[in-house]
């Protein structure tokens, strides 16, 4: 028996592993139960490199770094193993493999092909009531890339290296309580030996990893504190899970898109004392010149007179006062700004290159879309029309699930909306606001969400440089008003930009992502 | 070609045990269930139970159960058929056949070993 | 478990009659229904799986049709090697079952 601790916070991933099996023993059947209670997940795991997702699009089988081994046929069941319930699930035609899988012989062939090869450098496959056929080579068949949208919806053809998620039948109708198997058929290789799991009544509705012997839960809160224990043949893991309980500050921040206000906040912090520091570095140096401009004016040079003690002649003119040196003066306001802004930019309105990093670096998703990843997309490229439920699906307010360029997504027929649109990505943490399940896809959350809140930067830069300028030019002298350096248009081409990319009623950019997309890391 | 090669026949006393084997080859032995049938002398085929050597699944007969194991060697492409507290009902030639691939509805039997016969005498 | 029963249990036939030997299975299997041949002191022989799919080596005289819980095998012309053992197999479901057997004559 073995015993661990496991202290996190609240809104971070539970990583519950379960002891390994003995090496040379054939992988035991795990049984996750929690707190005293009867089992709520049972698992057969498969070999290395799977995993299964339970959430909103139901149970998911994850396939990691497919390669040329993993094509082939992949069967499933509500059911377990031991029951003959098995249908089609998908077939899985890894490119450059030199093999291609087909339920139908019919989605083998273009027109006038008949049902002969798909290409003269691969070998297709056809699923023959219940183990697959080689079938013959055609003579005249099209090019490969024409044929691939013929297949029907339930034909994968993946790049190697990219992971794919199959469901047991077709969101929303696929399998999402369990139990349920699944088998892979490969007519020439050694099958992949391929997860079963039940999902029992104590099981919690929430999002769920199974990877292997480790049990990972997204997004912990306070309910998932407790003891989970994981039996695997005769050893026990106990697992104690603490969680700390954030502040509701916190819970607020990660409803207003999670690290993008903070991050946001700082960096307009940051442009704010720079702004300042630049303000009065200027006005410094405008001061200097201003009083050295009027000490050595002719027309305005005078000189104090201080009569003599003593002496009843007075003179109007006497002793001439020095002029100040740069050096002179406020040097205490010059020392602070020296150490602030010693790289300060210059009093301007710099939100613009924020804007268009920002921008840039939400364009340069990884994966972003099947069309950029050809052939890596679940469907085949041109099959937009035929799928109900691929990455090349027309409605754009649904995420690709897909990783690495394969996957699935919800039917057409019923489009989620922006509250459904949980992404995926490499970083650490899972946000899931509404607490419902969703795969991962490759897609990074925006740097600058139009959700936020509709602050304008480039307005509170002018008032606070404004306020700073009018507050200190009482303590010192009147001097003409300060003018930007930038001239005006642009500098409010520049604020309106800005607001308009942040506005939270105007038009999604292309670019967004939209909602309120978490990420997570398969890594 | 698909071959299933089992061993020779067995004598044994009543109240012991017997393991017999059958050996593959011609195909890829983990990815085909192994089929176990016995047939009592004069008498028709009785389904045993089967195993799928890529996870060591197995399936039994009910009446089997408690009598009969099914393992399998995947270094050596061999399943066996262990039968435990014997009696003279257990008399029988014991066939095995490969079945269908694991996650499929293959249920028939192409392929058979020549059988081994096993002989529960006092 | 399914209970399959085949009849008659024993047939006796000239070569080159046609022959029908039946199958009935205690509740419906759709056609989940195999057939095998037994020579004396062989091996079982697929002749037919599914009810009535052909098997590649098997000469074109075996037949079979059927589907639910009612099932044939049809031999159209007997010859002398067709002697022996026939079985129906039920593969709809754990435990797979077999029928009694028709015992195959040659007169």
């Known amino acids: 028996q073995k015993l661990l601790q496991v202290e996190m916070e609240e809104g971070s991933d539970a990583v519950l592993p379960c002891l390994q099996d003995p090496p040379d023993g054939p992988p035991e059947r795990l049984i996750w139960s929690r707190d005293s209670q009867g089992p709520f997940l049972e698992l057969s795991p498969g070999s290395p490199g799977l995993g299964i997702h339970v959430g909103r699009l139901g149970i998911l089988l994850l396939i990691f770094n497919v390669s040329n081994e993993m094509g082939g046929f992949y069967l499933c069941q509500p059911a377990p193993p031991s029951q003959q319930a098995w249908q089609p699930g998908w077939t899985v035609s890894v490119e450059g493999s030199g093999e291609l899988f087909r339920w139908n012989a019919s989605d083998l062939g273009g027109p006038g092909c008949g049902l002969g090869n798909e290409s003269s450098s691969s070998q297709p496959y056809v699923w023959d009531r219940d183990h697959p056929k080689e079938w013959d080579m055609g003579p005249a068949c099209a090019s490969p890339r024409g044929d691939l949208n013929q297949s029907s919806s339930l034909d994968l053809t993946v790049a190697p290296g990219s992971t794919v998620w199959l469901s047991c039948g077709v969101p929303p109708a696929s399998v999402a309580t369990g139990p349920v198997s699944w088998a892979h058929i490969h007519p020439t290789k050694p099958n992949i030996l391929l997860p079963s799991l039940n999902l029992t009544a104590e099981s919690p509705a929430r999002e769920m990893w199974v990877l292997g012997p480790v049990l990972m839960l997204p997004q912990v809160t306070a309910v998932d504190a407790g003891m989970y224990v994981c039996r695997r043949g005769n050893l026990t893991t106990e697992i104690h899970v603490t969680i700390t309980v954030r502040p509701a500050i916190w819970h607020w921040l990660q409803r207003k898109s999670g690290w993008i206000v903070p991050v946001v906040a700082l960096l307009y912090l940051i442009f704010c004392l720079g702004c300042l520091v630049s303000f009065l570095h200027l006005r410094r140096a405008l001061i200097l010149r201003r009083k050295r401009k009027r000490m050595t004016d002719p027309t305005r040079r005078f000189f104090k007179v201080t009569p003599p003690a003593g002496n009843g002649a007075q003179s109007q003119y006497g002793n001439v006062l020095s002029l100040p040196t740069p050096t002179s003066g406020t040097g205490r306001a010059q020392r602070w700004a020296a150490s602030l802004g010693g790289a300060a930019a210059p009093y301007g309105h710099p939100l613009s290159d924020v804007q268009e990093a920002g921008a840039a670096g939400s364009r340069s998703l990884p994966r972003a879309s099947p069309e950029e990843e050809e052939g890596e997309a679940y469907e085949e490229p041109d099959s937009e029309a035929d799928s109900e439920f691929y990455e090349n699906d027309s409605n754009p307010a649904q995420d690709q699930l897909s990783q690495d360029g394969s996957g699935y997504e919800n039917p057409e027929e019923e489009p989620s909306g922006p509250e459904d649109d949980d992404s995926f990505s490499n970083a650490e943490s899972y946000e899931n606001e509404d607490e419902e399940l969703a795969p991962p896809v490759t897609r990074t959350a925006d740097f600058l969400s139009p959700h936020g809140s509709a602050w304008d930067p480039s307005r509170e830069a002018v008032s606070l440089g404004s306020q700073s300028y009018e507050d200190m030019r009482g303590i010192l002298y009147a001097a003409p008003q300060l003018r930007s350096s930038r001239p005006g248009p642009s500098y409010e081409e520049d604020a309106d930009s800005y607001e308009n990319m942040d506005n939270p009623d105007g038009p999604e950019p292309a670019w967004g992502a939209g909602g309120h997309g978490g990420t997570w890391s398969t890594r | 070609q698909v071959q299933l090669q089992q061993s020779g026949p067995e004598v044994v006393k009543p109240g012991a045990s017997v393991r017999m084997s059958c050996k593959a080859s011609?195909?890829?032995?983990?990815?085909?269930?192994i089929h176990w049938m016995k047939q009592r002398p004069g008498q028709g085929l009785e389904w045993v139970g089967c195993?799928?050597?890529?996870?060591?699944?197995?399936n039994y007969n009910e009446k089997f159960k408690g009598k009969a194991t099914l393992t399998a060697d995947k270094s050596s492409s061999t399943a066996y058929l262990q039968l435990s507290s014997l009696t003279s009902e257990d008399s029988a030639v014991y066939f095995c056949?490969?079945?269908?691939?694991?996650?499929?509805?293959?249920?028939?039997?192409?392929?058979w070993g020549q059988g081994t016969l096993v002989i529960v005498s006092a | 478990d399914i209970v399959m029963t085949q009849s008659p249990a024993t047939l006796s036939v000239t070569p080159g009659d046609r022959v029908s030997l039946s199958c009935r299975a205690s509740q419906s299997i759709s056609d989940f229904l195999h057939w095998y041949q037994q020579s004396s002191h062989e091996s079982p022989r697929l002749l037919i799986k599914?009810?009535?799919q052909s098997i590649s080596g098997i000469p074109s005289r075996f037949s079979g049709s059927g589907s639910g819980s009612d099932f044939t095998l049809t031999i159209n012309s007997v010859e002398p090697e067709d002697v022996g053992v026939y079985y129906c197999?039920?593969?709809?479901?754990?435990?797979?079952?077999f029928g009694g057997g028709t015992n195959l004559e040659i007169k």
């Open positions: 056949a490969r079945g269908g691939y694991y996650g499929s509805s293959y249920s028939w039997f192409a392929y």
């Open positions: 197999q039920n593969g709809h479901s754990f435990p797979y079952t």
């Open positions: 011609g195909y890829i032995f983990t990815n085909h269930y």
């Open positions: 599914y009810a009535s």
């Open positions: 195993i799928y050597p890529g996870n060591v699944n197995s």
